[in-house]
Amino acid sequence: LDSPYRPWSPLTFSPAQLTVLEGENATFVCHLPDVPESFVLNWYRVSPRNQTDKLAAFQENHTEPGKDRRFRVTRLPSGQDFHTTILAAQLNDSGIYLCGAIYLPPNTQIYESPRAELTVKERVLEPPTESPSPPPRLTGQGQGLVVGVTSVLVGVLLLLLLTWVLAAAFPRATRGACACGSEDEPLKEGPSAAPVFTVDYGELDFQWREKTPEPPAPCAPEQTEYATIVFPSRPGSPGPLPLRPEDGPCPWPL
């Protein structure tokens, strides 16, 4: 098999952090720097157990929506950029997302983008104001009162926050140490400079598969992975390892 000259050419997924109000559309852009003739572009959400769930895909010039039609992948006129959009985002859509590309034969390659975090904030309904007239301007004495009240409120809030932090930290010590991070916390990269793929490499699901219900995340997640491919991320270093068609079970969910 002819090995190509292939400089490191990663997918990008931006913005790295996106915040929207519930009900709004949330859009990330997945960028393929060099679009091949035949490819599949997948959009994933990372579950709390660090598993990837496919949301939607783009193949052969059309979108393949997932089970939830709110998730859409559309190709932009540039040909290299893809909009991955959540229509009418819900609070539980908050989490970690990424896109991945599978280059189909003959230049069979796998690329995965960096992760991006979506935060969907609750839409707070402002109570309607009774009159449209502007509020009366405060006198110097009134302003001082507002500052005083605000300071007290801030102090109380800080005290409550401190109490909550202590309450969260110390009971854990009495119950026994647990190395679990918060579920909402973005997944931290290890000390290694090279990105580690975390997509389940057990199979290539070219068709949609039924998602099995996920058991609750154990305190110490299992360390087993089917095959973790570590790609060098230095510019100019070779890209991902080419996959030969005969390499057995497909290593990436399509």
Partner: antibody, heavy 116, light 112 residues
């Protein structure tokens, strides 16, 4: 209408060099990988080289690797094939094709003859 | 690389008849996505090759439905129904499962 027009073919001595060009029109050139395929006097087709849309990766057949270089200028909608250390077995009609493997469009070809 | 084998000549056919052209690959061209990575081209006399069929059975844009492709992972057939004079030429199959891309030697179709 997609059009690919090759030029630069000539009679050249063994060991010589030649640069072929392919002017593309009728499609968004920088969205497509491009390839060169040649047809020898026996009418056998041989894939020569492929270049991706953004020039990130190139592939060559073993018979030309190290001697031929495929390149492109997306601003000029042009594909090139620089051929060095030419051999008599490089004598062929050289076709420019759109695509990395599917080859949906071909030019009319340019003839390269390597002979003493 | 993958070796593609074709019969060089088909028996001359009469206009209006059907003809089958075969092609064999030294390894399976069926990929994990369920697609078979084989193309068919026709080169008419004095012309450049023209894509007829891609991914074993999908007709290229503008190609007559008289042309159809089929096969397994290693054995392939191009079927031409109701042959016309314009179908005369050399038919090539090509594998695109991996680089280097390889073509068969071609099968010449002639009319009686």
């Amino acid at each position: 209408e997609v059009q690919l027009v090759e030029s630069g073919g000539d009679l050249v001595k063994p060991g010589g060099s030649l640069k072929l060009s392919c002017a593309a029109s009728g499609f968004t050139f920088n969205n497509f990988g491009m390839s060169w395929v040649r047809q020898n006097p026996d009418k056998r087709l041989e894939w020569v080289a492929t270049l991706s849309s953004g020039s990130s990766y190139t592939y060559y057949s073993d018979s030309v690797k190290g001697r031929f270089t495929i390149s492109r200028d997306n601003a000029k909608n042009t594909l090139y094939l620089q051929m060095n250390s030419l051999k008599s077995e490089d004598t062929a009609m050289y076709y420019c094709t759109r695509g990395e493997s599917r080859f949906a469009y071909w030019g009319q070809g340019t003839l390269v003859t390597v002979s003493a | 690389g993958v070796v593609i084998t074709q019969d060089e000549l088909s028996n001359p056919v009469t206009s209006g008849e059907s003809v089958s052209i075969s092609c064999r690959s030294s390894k399976s061209l069926l990929y994990k996505d369920g697609k078979t990575y084989l193309n068919w081209f026709l080169q008419r006399p004095g012309q450049s090759p023209q894509l007829l069929i891609y991914l074993m059975s999908t007709r290229a844009s503008g190609v007559s439905d008289r042309f159809s492709g089929s096969g397994s992972g290693t054995d392939f057939t191009l079927e031409i129904s109701r042959v016309k004079a314009e179908d005369v030429g050399v038919y090539y199959c090509q594998q695109l499962i991996e680089y280097p891309l390889t073509f068969g030697a071609g099968t010449k179709l002639e009319l009686k």
